[in-house]
């Protein structure tokens, strides 16, 4: 009984349960391939518990191994559109600090209109994740079609 | 030492480790786009620890943020079949209670024969998840090709 | 306070946080469809905390339910290449011990050049996971395009 009480009194943050699920806000200005994200219960089913948004990019607050996942659906798209506009590529990476810049996850659309994937990766406090969509096609802002999230898994 | 003993004595359920992985049982009757799921060790590698099945649909028993994942493969399918029968779309959503009805995850097959994705989403006790497959193509019942699951991540 | 101290003193391994993320090392020798994996911080962002590699295949060290995920991208590939070389299929399964041999996850490339999926599955200490790529196309060894991992979720 003592354990259960103690467990309830510990703030979740001390257990390292950082988690975020974001929805697309907008694409970047010209020559900026980044997608800009937003999150919060007022917006729907998106949320940030631990990580933060910095100008639409996700910043990590706790060191650890994270599961990073993403789905992006192109807005006005058929298999012929997708192949005609090829290559359309999505890359998720650490974009700052510059010393830790690296691509974590990369996918091309080819003849499809949706990409979805996930991976485990070590991230450090202060790492900012960017999602670059290169090509001429636009992403859907529907919250069930395009989303991006992270989940802290272990130290 | 006291902590370790206490931890072992606590039932797993009190840690909130609700998890389920389901295999396809059958498709719905005419005009019902829902897939009907089944789970349990006697069936293979599917299981329910916490959530329950209600007439083939998954019902959540614990509030929290969940990782929802799905893969659906079409049974008799080639890229030409898939494009000829387009649009074939899969949507995962909360279908009851009606007041919380919402689409969580949506994917189209386009020229592919498999879709797979995952996302984090808040779910509440009593939420029932439905998976709607619209189109004329049938899903494979092979357990390594078509499956649907949830994992409780945090309160 | 006693709880927090005790929690910090427990080795992570006792909490069952086994996790691994691997990068592609090489394809198999003659008539061997298996992909051979490697992991470790010296190689980049891959790691093994708990599971081990046995001749390039992933061996599980702790019983439990795991989230298994994979992404494989073909190296020289366009939608026309992929369809011309069809069927190219990836299967993840338990390959030893032979008594537990089973396919867990199967995907075909059809007209795409990347497959990505994930699933929950029970695994036991000593289970070895193999990833079989059948067909004539070659996988990319880029660490952001091809990776394979497992995460212990619960007992």
């Amino acid at each position: 009984q003592r354990f259960a009480q103690a467990q309830q009194q510990l703030p979740l943050e001390s257990l390292g349960w950082d988690v975020a699920e974001l929805q697309l806000n907008h694409t970047g200005p010209q020559q900026d391939p980044r997608l800009y994200w937003q999150g919060g219960p007022a917006l729907g089913r998106s949320f940030l518990h631990g990580p933060e948004l910095d100008k639409g990019q996700l910043r990590i607050h706790r060191d650890g191994i994270y599961m990073v996942h993403i789905q992006v659906t192109l807005a006005i798209c058929s298999s012929t559109t997708a192949s005609r506009h090829h290559p359309t590529t999505l890359a998720v990476g650490i974009c700052s600090p510059a010393s830790r810049s690296i691509s974590l996850l990369r996918l091309s659309f080819h003849q499809g209109c949706t990409i979805a994937s996930q991976r485990l990766t070590p991230l450090a406090r202060g790492d900012t994740l960017c999602t670059n969509l290169t090509g001429t096609l636009l992403p859907s802002r529907n919250t069930d079609e395009t989303f991006f999230g992270v989940q802290w898994v272990r130290p | 030492q006291r902590f370790a003993q206490a931890q072992q004595q606590l039932p797993l359920e009190s840690l909130g480790w609700d998890v389920a992985e389901l295999q396809l049982n059958h498709t719905g009757p005419q005009q019902d786009p829902r897939l009907y799921w089944q789970g349990g060790p006697a069936l293979g590698r599917s299981f329910l620890h916490g959530p329950e099945l209600d007439k083939g649909q998954l019902r959540i028993h614990r509030d929290g943020i969940y990782m929802v994942h799905i893969q659906v493969t079409l049974a008799i399918c080639s890229s030409t079949t898939a494009s000829r029968h387009h649009p074939t779309t899969l949507a995962v959503g909360i279908c009851s209670p009606a007041s919380r009805s919402i689409s969580l995850l949506r994917l189209s097959f386009h020229q592919g024969c498999t879709i797979a994705s995952q996302r984090l989403t808040p779910l509440a006790r009593g939420d029932t998840l439905c998976t709607n497959l619209t189109g004329t193509l049938l899903p494979s019942r092979n357990t390594d090709e078509t499956f649907f699951g949830v994992q409780w991540v945090r309160p | 306070q006693r709880f927090a101290q005790a929690q910090q003193q427990l080795p992570l391994e006792s909490l069952g946080w086994d996790v691994a993320e691997l990068q592609l090392n090489h394809t198999g020798p003659q008539q061997d469809p298996r992909l051979y994996w490697q992991g470790g911080p010296a190689l980049g962002r891959s790691f093994l905390h708990g599971p081990e590699l046995d001749k390039g295949q992933l061996r599980i060290h702790r019983d439990g339910i795991y989230m298994v995920h994979i992404q494989v991208t073909l190296a020289i590939c366009s939608s026309t290449t992929a369809s011309r070389h069809h069927p190219t299929t990836l299967a993840v399964g338990i390959c030893s011990p032979a008594s537990r041999s089973i396919s867990l996850l199967r995907l075909s490339f059809h007209q795409g050049c990347t497959i990505a999926s994930q699933r929950l599955t029970p695994l036991a200490r000593g289970d070895t996971l193999c990833t079989n790529l059948t067909g004539t196309l070659l996988p990319s060894r880029n660490t952001d395009e091809t990776f394979f991992g497992v995460q212990w979720v619960r007992p």
């Epitope: - | - | 003659q30 020289i76 880029n142 660490t143």
Partner: nanobody, 125 residues
Framework: QVQLVESGGGLVQPGGSLRLSCAAS????????MGWYRQAPGKQRELVAA???????NYADSVKGRFTISRDNAKNTVYLQMNSLKPEDTAVYYC???????????????????WGQGTLVTVSS
């Protein structure tokens, strides 16, 4: 620039044998795989056999048991031993190489595909 030079084609009677060779030269970083494709008149180019740098081999169903692919890594050369040849094996045979160029830290691989000019194999009595 990488070049592939094929040799060994020619006219052979049904049931006979031929050995094709393909040598890669130029600024080769690493050959990931080499293989042979063929194209018969009015048909699409199809894979005959391929071999990876780890020794993995793949054969078209139509040539299994008759053709053998092998590779000499030191010479950057691939061979195709063709036995029990049939009239339907008549085609232009093309050598193919997939190059893997590694650069940077962390390593990033760039994949390139190179084709030979082709060598004609005619199986006829």
């Amino acid at each position: 620039q990488v070049q592939l030079v094929e040799s060994g084609g020619g006219l052979v009677q049904p049931g006979g044998s031929l050995r094709l060779s393909c040598a890669a030269s130029g600024s080769i970083f690493s050959i990931y795989a080499m293989g042979w494709y063929r194209q018969a008149p009015g048909k699409q180019r199809e894979l005959v056999a391929a071999i990876t740098n780890s020794g993995g081999t793949n054969y078209a169903d139509s040539v299994k048991g008759r053709f053998t692919i092998s590779r000499d890594n030191a010479k950057n050369t691939v061979y195709l031993q063709m036995n029990s040849l049939k009239p339907e094996d008549t085609a232009v045979y093309y050598c193919n190489a997939v190059l893997e160029q590694a650069s940077g830290d962390p390593v990033v691989y760039r994949y390139l595909e190179v084709w030979g000019q082709g060598t004609l194999v005619t199986v006829s009595s």
